[in-house]
Interface confidence: low
């Protein structure tokens, strides 16, 4: 398996976000397909879960991103991506998008840092 | 206006060490991690390692682990990079930079000159 | 680490030519990030995530590919695209750049 994120995503406060996570595998996608995604605070705090998805997705039951997050991926497209929602400062951080598709080997996680910015975007700013 | 300040030059003795610096302004110096990148003419970009500002964690190119000490002082929005033993194959301009979405930002360079 | 190999390393066009700049991969990467850069200038991103046009960046370039195969087009070209053009993979660690294309106005 081949994981393939973009490296950086910028948010504004108070809006959702897609975490885009895509995959490749030379087995076929089927019901043992599994993916995992998990948050690195930016703080360097611990390892939190964000979701699971495993035939049916779960979303997690307590925690930070209670009802803040859905699935947004299509595996027979290799999408492996999430819908996170109402964006918090605290929200910073590295997301990490794991998924397994045996037979096929475990592939690197797939890493994407999330910046959660006041209204105005960095990609409005005229570069120096 | 994002800013990502760095001296123009250094030379430095072979065997020496430097410590580069890297201040930011225009944007919160926490939210960014800071990257660092080698340019030696004809032989393209390295990137170097990278550093989380918030706590100071670290992520290195493998062939750079021994040679750069990345830190940061959030009091001053500043980012250093020391590189230790020069030799001639460290001379090169060191670029730091912030990657976003859709835009990166670039210090000027520091061209740093081992010689002696 | 992952290999990205530029070619042409130097090439000449005419004005109004079309231009293609092409980065091989020494294996699969997810995306491409291309940088424009001029004698004495810092680098300027140029295309992000394979196909998008950084801010400013003029219509008339374009980036494609996938897996192994990216290129940066320039339907046609002008006196202020000569430049070194760079690619940059962020799909493995660590990230890695191409030896660049240094593009000339013939």
């Known amino acids: 398996v081949e994981i393939y994120t973009s490296r950086v995503l910028e948010a504004v406060n108070g809006t959702d976000a897609r975490l885009k996570c895509t995959f490749s595998s030379f087995a076929p996608v089927g019901d043992a397909l599994t993916v995992t995604w998990n948050f690195r605070p930016l703080d360097g705090g611990p390892e939190q879960f964000v979701f699971y998805y495993h035939i049916d997705p779960f979303q997690p039951m307590s925690g930070r991103f209670k009802d803040r997050v859905s699935w947004d991926g299509n595996p027979e497209r290799y999408d492996a991506s999430i819908l996170l929602w109402k964006l918090q400062f605290d929200d910073n951080g590295t997301y990490t998008c794991q998924v397994k598709n045996p037979p096929d080997v475990d592939g690197v996680i797939g890493e994407i840092r999330l910046s959660v910015v006041h209204t105005v975007r960095f990609s409005e700013i005229h570069f120096l | 206006q994002v800013q990502l300040q760095q001296p123009g030059a250094e030379l430095v003795k072979p065997g020496a060490s430097v410590k580069l610096s890297c201040k930011a302004s225009?944007?919160?110096?926490?939210n960014y991690w800071m990257h660092w990148v080698k340019l030696r003419p004809g032989q393209g970009f390295e990137w170097?390692?990278?550093?989380?500002?918030?706590?100071?964690?670290?992520d290195y190119n493998e062939k750079f682990k021994r040679k750069a000490t990345l830190t940061v002082d959030k009091s001053s929005s500043t980012a250093y990079m020391q590189l230790s033993s020069l030799t001639s194959e460290d001379s090169a301009v060191y670029y730091c930079?912030?990657?976003?979405?859709?835009?990166?930002?670039w210090g000027q360079g520091t061209t740093l000159t081992v010689s002696s | 680490q992952i290999v990205l190999t530029q070619s042409p390393a130097l090439m000449s066009a005419s004005p109004g030519e079309r231009v293609t700049l092409t980065c091989s991969a020494s294996?699969?990467?997810?995306?491409m990030y291309w940088y424009q850069q001029k004698p004495g200038s810092s680098p300027k991103p140029w295309i992000y995530?394979?196909?998008n046009l950084a801010s400013g960046v003029p219509a008339r370039f374009s980036g494609s590919g996938s897996g192994t195969s990216y290129s940066l087009t320039i339907s046609s070209m002008e006196a202020e695209d000569a430049a070194t053009y760079y690619c940059?993979?962020?799909?493995?660690?660590?990230?890695?750049f191409g030896a660049g294309t240094k593009l000339e106005l013939k």
């Open positions: 930079t912030i990657y976003t979405t859709a835009l990166d930002y």
């Open positions: 225009g944007y919160t110096f926490t």
């Open positions: 170097i390692g990278e550093i989380n500002p918030t706590n100071g964690g670290t």
């Open positions: 294996s699969s990467v997810g995306y």
């Open positions: 995530v394979t196909s």
């Open positions: 940059q993979q962020w799909s493995s660690n660590p990230p890695t």
